[in-house]
């Protein structure tokens, strides 16, 4: 019969508010009390197997003892209740678990959504965690009708999906109960009529038709959510080209009521658009749809917008009355050539003369041409059409090439190599930009560009690289033929120099010595020599830097000791930094040229 | 008590116009969506506009749509039915209701006749 | 287009007898159905609506049961004032359509 429990702790099952106070009573069974011998006085009270300070009992009377506990803080505590018995055993009487946390606040933030086809979701901001499990349940009526409970799930405590069809134009009231065992509270109520609240489907079988007539139009076609025939829908229409990462888009006020079709206009020619779009009710109540599948198209070919910059180049090793002359042209980018380039159309015209025609599929042609001034054109062409035309003026053998450019600079920027000059005050026609890497082991070989007569700074569209020496010519071209060309150096980006200088002796004294070097190499410069650091030392002295001006290669160090070693290297600097050459040693002699013979004569 | 009043009704021919009216009282129309339904002489029910309360939001059926406008003045508490470009297929007795999912107030009806 | 379709054009009853009236939809409309009936030279009634609620008035001997795609409308206990036409709606998604209508006869 002692099976059964001694006494009993009430209450039984306790949930107790956070930070609370909270007291618990122990009472004892007659019969165990006899049994043991022993009353209320007996009673230990424990914590998770802790026992509580006698300061927080209570006897209440020879059967029953309290315990309180102020500002609980622990989410579950392991109460019992043990008499003390014969010989200081403990003998449990009676356990609970008091379990605490917060009651559930009001929730906030009620929000609906009928994405389309599908029963109406709602949900909510359930508020500060409350340790209990509390139960959210949302309600929905109308003014006649009341519908069903949504009780959320307990994995998805902050939303439910109602179980009835959404009904449009009848305002539905809507607000949760969040309940759990230290109370209940309701939501603020909400009231709307699910139109509103619509996320439709994405519009389908969006597709992209091409004009042979307009090659900057594309017409999209597409077909409408069903909801369409429930609200007016508008539309975002997104386009992009095939390689890009960002989006344009259509203006919102152009897709404003519902519709099946839209003409991109302003697109370039010969060119893949991918397009998508969504859409929503046009009063921008709701949600906006997903966006559709992707689509693409191609506008159609143009003909070519621009002509292609063109230039030439003299043989000058030419034969008596004749000479080489290399015409040379640049591919059109995509976005001006408009379409696929066929060939390119050259006419040569000696001055007041006959006229000669080639085509070519090349972008170059090599003509022998008399000592006369010419006049050469150039058209490029595609499925369309043909470019305007390129003209060039090569001048007669004769010509005296005036007027350059002037205060030529060239810098590095954003890893860009950048270009500027003073424009003649001559009319410019446009400007030819030749560049090559400057260097001791291979010819320049030259890279060029055109620019419009109007420009004044550019960056060079080459493939440039870091530590090599540009050097960068500027050629005005004028009505009549060239102007004269301006050169200048620069780097895309310096580096300290790949070898230091080497240094040596070019003349040793008891006092000083002469000492020079080679101008390093432009392959391993990698930047503008700036300036020379000559460092010097005897084995036991501190060393000594003299800075040298970068033209030098020759200096002279002088207060030297005679009859001393002297360890010497040297360093040469760009704008980033320094690079040392070898060390070299040199002894001074003891005396001087003519001490040592004065010493002998004086014996 | 509800009272649902149309009128407007009429003969005339294919190609015409009309405009029905639906006076109510008895409830507070503001609150309701309301729809114009008609029964054909072979007593088919169609359902041809709807109307939310305040009237920013309709429906039509593709048979009208283009055609009907159906619109609403909550002050004078009055419902109305535009319809143009008649077909004989228009003729039938107009009920006009407010709608909760069902209809569950409906008028006496007005008959529009469309014929040549 | 849902298309709700009464098999029965016209049914036979007698008074006090019970009688079930059917409507059939082409695809799930949910709960989403309301009955009207509709008496000789009157306009509609509404008596269910979400298939099952009965609209403030209507007497205790009407009840609406079914989802889905089959409902009922059962008319118990049968009175002469029955005599009338009875028709489904349905509500779950536009265009709302109506059946073809169910004429119910006193013997």
């Known amino acids: 019969e002692l099976l059964d429990p001694c006494g009993y702790i009430s209450p039984e099952s306790p949930v107790v508010q956070l930070h609370s106070n909270f007291t618990a009573v122990c009472v004892l069974k007659e019969k165990c009390m006899d049994y043991f011998h022993v009353n209320a006085n007996y009673i230990v009270w424990k914590t998770n197997h802790f026992t509580i300070p006698k300061e927080q009992y209570t006897i209440i009377n020879r059967t029953a003892s309290s315990v309180t506990f102020t500002d609980i803080a622990s989410l579950n505590i392991q109460l019992t209740c043990n008499i003390l018995t014969f010989g200081q055993l403990e003998q449990n009487v009676y356990g609970i678990t008091i379990i605490s946390g917060l009651p559930p606040e009001k929730p906030k933030n009620l929000s609906c959504i009928v994405n389309e086809g599908k029963k109406m979701r709602c949900e909510w901001d359930g508020g500060r965690e409350t340790h209990l499990e509390t139960n959210f349940t949302l309600k929905s009526e109308w003014a006649t009708h009341k519908f069903a409970d949504c009780k959320a799930k307990r994995d998805t405590p902050t939303s439910c999906t109602v179980d009835y069809s959404t009904v449009y134009f009848v305002n539905i009231e809507v607000w949760v109960e969040a309940e759990n065992a230290l109370g209940k509270v309701t939501s603020d109520h909400i009231n709307f009529d699910p139109v509103y609240k619509v996320k439709p489907n994405p519009p389908h079988n969006l597709s992209v038709i091409n004009s042979e007539e307009l090659s900057s139009i594309l017409k999209l076609t597409w077909t409408n959510p069903s909801i369409k025939s429930v609200i007016i829908l508008k539309y975002n229409i997104q386009y992009r080209t095939k390689d890009a990462s960002t989006w344009s888009q259509i203006p919102p006020e152009d897709t404003a009521s519902t519709r099946s079709s839209f003409t991109v206009q302003d697109l370039k020619p010969f060119t893949e658009y991918v397009f998508r779009i969504r859409c929503m009710k046009e009063d921008g109540k709701g949600y906006w749809s997903d966006w559709s599948e992707e689509a693409s198209g191609i506008t159609y070919e143009d003909r070519p917008s621009k002509a292609p910059s063109f230039w030439y180049k003299i043989d000058p090793s030419h034969t008596q009355g004749y000479r080489t002359v290399q015409l040379v042209w640049k591919t059109l980018p995509p976005f001006e050539a408009n379409g696929k380039i066929l060939d390119y159309e050259v006419t040569l015209t000696r001055w007041k003369s006959h006229l000669q025609n080639y085509t070519v599929n090349a972008t170059k042609l090599t003509v022998n041409l008399t000592n006369d001034r010419y006049l050469a054109t150039l058209t490029v062409r595609n499925l369309v059409g043909k470019s305007d035309a390129a003209v060039l003026t090569i001048p007669a053998c004769d010509f005296q090439a005036t007027h350059p450019v002037m205060d030529l600079k060239a810098f590095p920027k954003d890893n860009m190599l950048w270009v500027e000059w003073t424009t003649p005050r001559e009319s410019v026609k446009k400007y030819i930009l030749e560049w090559c890497v400057l260097s001791d082991k291979a010819p320049c070989i030259t890279d060029w560009q055109q620019e419009d007569g109007t420009v004044h700074r550019t960056y060079l569209r080459g493939n440039l690289a870091e530590s090599k020496c540009y050097l960068i010519t500027v050629t005005p071209v004028y009505a009549d033929g060239p102007g004269s060309p301006e050169s200048i150096k620069a780097y895309l980006k310096q580096a300290p120099p790949s070898k230091g200088p080497t240094v040596r002796t070019k003349k040793v004294g008891k006092n000083e010595a002469v000492l020079e070097w080679d101008q390093l190499p432009v392959d391993v410069q990698n930047g503008f020599i700036r300036n020379y650091t000559i460092f010097y030392r005897t084995i036991i002295g501190n060393e000594t830097a003299v800075n040298v001006d970068s033209s030098h290669t020759e200096y002279t160090l002088s207060s030297l000791t005679s009859d001393t070693l002297y360890m010497v290297r040297m360093a040469a600097y760009t704008d980033e930094g320094g690079k040392d050459g070898p060390e070299f040693t040199f002894t001074t002699p003891k005396f001087a040229q003519g001490e040592i013979e004065h010493h002998h004569h004086h014996h | 008590e509800v009272q649902v009043v149309e009128s407007g009704g009429d003969l005339l021919l294919p190609g015409g116009s009309l405009k029905l009216s639906c006076a109510v009282s008895g409830f507070t129309f503001n609150a309701y969506g309301m729809s114009w339904v008609r029964q054909t002489p072979d007593k088919r029910l169609e359902l041809v506009a709807t109307?939310?309360?305040?009237?920013?939001?309709?429906y039509y059926p593709d048979s009208v749509k283009g055609r009907f406008t159906i619109s609403r003045d909550n002050a004078k508490h009055t419902l109305y039915l535009q319809m143009s470009s008649l077909k004989s297929e228009d003729t039938a007795m107009y009920y006009c209701?407010?709608?909760?999912?069902?209809?569950?107030?409906w008028g006496q009806g007005t008959l529009v006749t469309v014929s040549a | 287009v849902i298309v709700l379709t009464q098999s029965h054009k016209f049914m036979s009853t007698s008074v006090g007898d019970r009688v079930s009236i059917t409507c059939k939809a082409s695809?799930?409309?949910?709960?989403?159905v309301a009955w009207y009936q509709q008496k000789v030279g009157h306009s509609p009634k509404l008596l269910i609506y979400?298939?099952?609620t009965r609209h403030t008035g209507v007497p205790d001997r009407f009840t609406g049961s079914g989802s889905g795609t089959d409902f009922t409308l059962t008319i118990s206990n049968v009175q002469s004032e029955d005599l009338a036409d009875y028709f489904c709606q349905q509500y779950s998604s536009y265009p709302y359509t109506f059946g073809g209508g169910t004429k119910l006869e006193i013997k």
């Open positions: 695809q799930d409309v949910d709960t989403a």
């Open positions: 979400w298939a099952v």
């Open positions: 209701a407010n709608f909760y999912g069902g209809f569950p107030y």
């Open positions: 109307i939310n309360s305040n009237g920013d939001s309709t």
